[in-house]
């Protein structure tokens, strides 16, 4: 049985910077996860690996190690940051993200995260993926769940 539940809550903040010469966008995206331990003993969150995709291209990856211990029947909220780069064949996005005439420069990103937990030598991996709106035109702090993008057709399995 799935004894550990991972829920991707959403984007917490996105901080943006630009390289004008390279027509490159740098987005530091902080995400929030809720990890619930339904066991009657503590489990260790060994690592979190995350990646962000834009238009089916991976634009950022991150890995956190030895994160925390979650007590029995407890939940912890964990934030993790993925540095992303929109450049090269996607440099056309630079114009959109820096266009002054638009107030909100939302782009749709796919957030993928895998949480590895361990207990008594046993490892368990749980993965989630979600589409999210992120504003690439300014620094933004989101209410949790505010950035969810629901109207995207999920790719066929």
């Amino acid at each position: 049985p799935r004894s550990i539940d991972v829920k991707y809550i959403g984007v917490k903040s996105a901080y943006v910077s630009y390289d004008v010469q390279k027509r490159t966008i740098y987005l530091n995206i902080t995400n929030t996860l809720n990890i619930t331990n339904n066991n009657y003993y503590s489990v260790e969150v060994e690592n979190i690996t995350a990646q962000v995709q834009f238009s089916k291209t991976v634009i950022g990856k991150a890995r956190l190690n030895n994160i925390t211990i979650i007590g029995p029947l407890d939940m912890k909220q964990i934030d993790y940051t993925v540095p992303t780069v929109i450049a090269e064949e996607m440099s056309y996005m630079y114009d959109f993200c820096t266009l002054i005439s638009i107030k909100v420069h939302n782009i749709v990103l796919m957030m993928q995260v895998t949480v590895t937990t361990t207990y008594f030598g046993h490892s368990e991996q749980i993965s989630q993926e979600r589409y999210q709106y992120v504003d690439c035109g300014r620094n933004t702090t989101y209410q949790l769940g505010q950035s969810e993008y629901l109207n995207v057709l999920q790719p066929q399995q």
Epitope: Y40, Y41, S42, L73, D74, F120
Partner: antibody
Framework: EVQLQQSGPELVKPGASVKMSCKAS????????MHWLKQKPGQGLEWIAH????????KYNEKFKGKATLTSDRSSSTAYMELNSLTSEDSAIYYC?????FGRGDYFHYWGQGTTVTVSS | DIVLTQSPASLAVSLGQRATISCRAS??????????IHWYQQKPGQPPKLLIY???NLESGVPARFSGSGSGTDFTLNIHPVEEEDAATYYC?????????FGGGARLEIK
Amino acid sequence: EVQLQQSGPELVKPGASVKMSCKASGYTFTNYVMHWLKQKPGQGLEWIAHITPHNDGTKYNEKFKGKATLTSDRSSSTAYMELNSLTSEDSAIYYCARSGQFGRGDYFHYWGQGTTVTVSS
Amino acid sequence: DIVLTQSPASLAVSLGQRATISCRASKSVSTSGSIYIHWYQQKPGQPPKLLIYLTSNLESGVPARFSGSGSGTDFTLNIHPVEEEDAATYYCQHSGELPWTFGGGARLEIK
């Protein structure tokens, strides 16, 4: 070696309260749930409640709500159960027991030796 | 609450023979593919001792003559061959949902 050492027998008057203890050793106290169970003489077992010592979260059997109160002391790795408004129906052996470590671990892997409570005037 | 009914309430089995104890649940104790039925042995003046967890898993240090089986709402503890030291009361317990409950017990006597 995991050990659960319970406090000694109690003889109490009807209407009074009693607080018993269960001292854990041989493992990290906050890493497991502690349960309390009741066994009347010559009868079966009843689950009363459990406590998660790392945050003092409790879950009670509806039957024992208002009767039993669970607490813990992390500094001494000790769990406590207080029973109030005692009647002859509360005369029993009370066990503390620790969860197992497989899957959801919701069975009773290690047991204390039991605390006998006798309610008599 | 889930009620567990054990039968027989007492049994007498000859040394070396098979003892079979049944435990019937008033509703399913399965959750997410696991069956949350466990078996304990209790001798006079002692706390219960875990024998079998999750229907059929033998607890470490418990002799292989103990075995558990079952599905749905019907479960069985088998002891074969029975030895003198197996004289005790046996309880089934479920943890499918709160509150966890026990069967009424089955007292095994060795003939």
